[in-house]
């Protein structure tokens, strides 16, 4: 069987205050069972950008519907991009536990900065 | 064509052991979780045990009991039941999982089961 | 562990008529919820997931609505290969998976 790999294929994301910015994630296996969610940095100290199981994120949305089977794609965009949401942003996959979920794998990470304004 | 073919059913005595295999074909068997859910009886579904890649999940009610497993190269669920009880005693069907809402899982096919009766 | 309840246990129906079947959850699962259908001697078969997702070959006539904690599986007109047992299942919280205590549904 095929090993999880975690796919960012952008390495830098150029965005625009006031737009919105996607991005992209897709796994290459369904397995382990567990959810994937988003996180801006690394470490204890890492941001929650978007869990679809529980949380509030207004800004947040998925590319992929949400009833679509054997989903590979966790791609999300968020909306009315400021400057405090630079950084880098991971996908990373949980290995379902009980009662926790348990970190398996992270993408290796998408940084998002600031481009110039379009003139 | 999705299938799945339970066997491995029969009569014990409690406390006694039996293994029961579940042979998938018709889907790329590996990719997927499987999972087996249990009928006693004239009463309802219960799900008893999941697996994943090497990850496993029991119902309380056969954990330490209870073994889970699978041979991708054989295309084939299993689950090793010992120390069995009276209540074990039911239709033990295997079923596909299916993911949505990017980490639940549902059955969407289901193989036609077979009898495990735990007497004496 | 997230309990399902179904209501009722029977409901007797026409041939024809509509029948409305009922899943309470006992915590909010979202729309991770799951309808199967049970004839005698033969395995559940899916019906409908995601709350209101109809699967591949299952007749217009089987609809799901509901979300949070209330769910409902609406069998427009009766058929005469509709009288079975259907269970609910939420995948929202686990392990365990849970299912419904099932309703019977039976000719009038």
């Known amino acids: 069987e095929e090993e999880l790999q975690m796919i960012q294929p952008e390495k830098l994301l150029l965005v625009t205050v006031g737009k919105t910015a996607t991005l992209h994630c897709t796994v290459t296996s369904l397995l382990p069972v567990g959810p994937v969610l988003w996180f801006r940095g690394v470490g204890p100290g890492r941001e929650l950008i978007y869990n679809q199981k529980e949380g509030h994120f207004p800004r947040v949305t998925t590319v992929s519907d949400l009833t679509k089977r054997n989903n590979m794609d966790f791609s999300i965009r968020i909306s009315s991009i400021t400057p405090a949401d630079v950084g880098t942003y991971y996908c990373v996959k949980f290995r379902k536990g009980s009662p926790e979920n348990v970190e398996f794998k992270s993408g290796p990470g998408t940084e998002m900065a600031l481009g110039a304004k379009p003139s | 064509e999705v299938q799945l073919l339970e066997s491995g059913g029969g009569v014990v005595q409690p406390g006694g052991s039996l293994r029961l295999s579940c042979a998938a074909s018709?889907?790329?068997?590996?990719?997927?979780?499987v999972t087996w859910v249990r009928q006693a009886p004239g009463k309802g579904l219960e799900w008893v045990s999941t697996i994943g890649s090497g990850d496993t999940y029991y119902a309380d009610s056969v954990k330490g009991r209870f073994t889970i497993s699978r041979d991708n190269s054989k295309n084939t669920l299993y689950l090793q039941m010992n120390s069995l009880r009276a209540e074990d005693t039911a239709v033990y069907y295997c079923?596909?999982?299916?993911?949505?809402?990017?980490?639940?899982?549902?059955?969407?096919?289901w193989g036609q089961g077979t009898l495990v009766t735990v007497s004496s | 562990e997230i309990v399902l309840t179904q209501s009722p246990a029977t409901l007797s129906v026409s041939p024809g008529e509509r029948a409305t079947l009922s899943c309470r959850a006992s915590q909010n699962v979202k729309n991770d919820l799951a309808w199967y259908q049970q004839k005698p001697g033969q395995a559940p078969r899916l019906l409908i997931y995601?709350?209101?997702i109809r699967e591949t070959g299952i007749p217009a006539r089987f609809s799901g609505s509901g979300s949070g904690t209330e769910f409902t599986l609406t069998i427009s007109s009766l058929q005469s290969e509709d009288f079975a047992v259907y269970y609910c299942q939420q995948y929202y919280d686990w392990p365990p998976f849970t299912f419904g205590g099932g309703t019977k549904v039976e000719i009038k």
């Open positions: 018709g889907f790329s068997f590996s990719n997927f979780a």
């Open positions: 995601a709350a209101r």
């Open positions: 079923a596909k999982d299916s993911t949505v809402s990017w980490s639940g899982d549902f059955f969407d096919y």
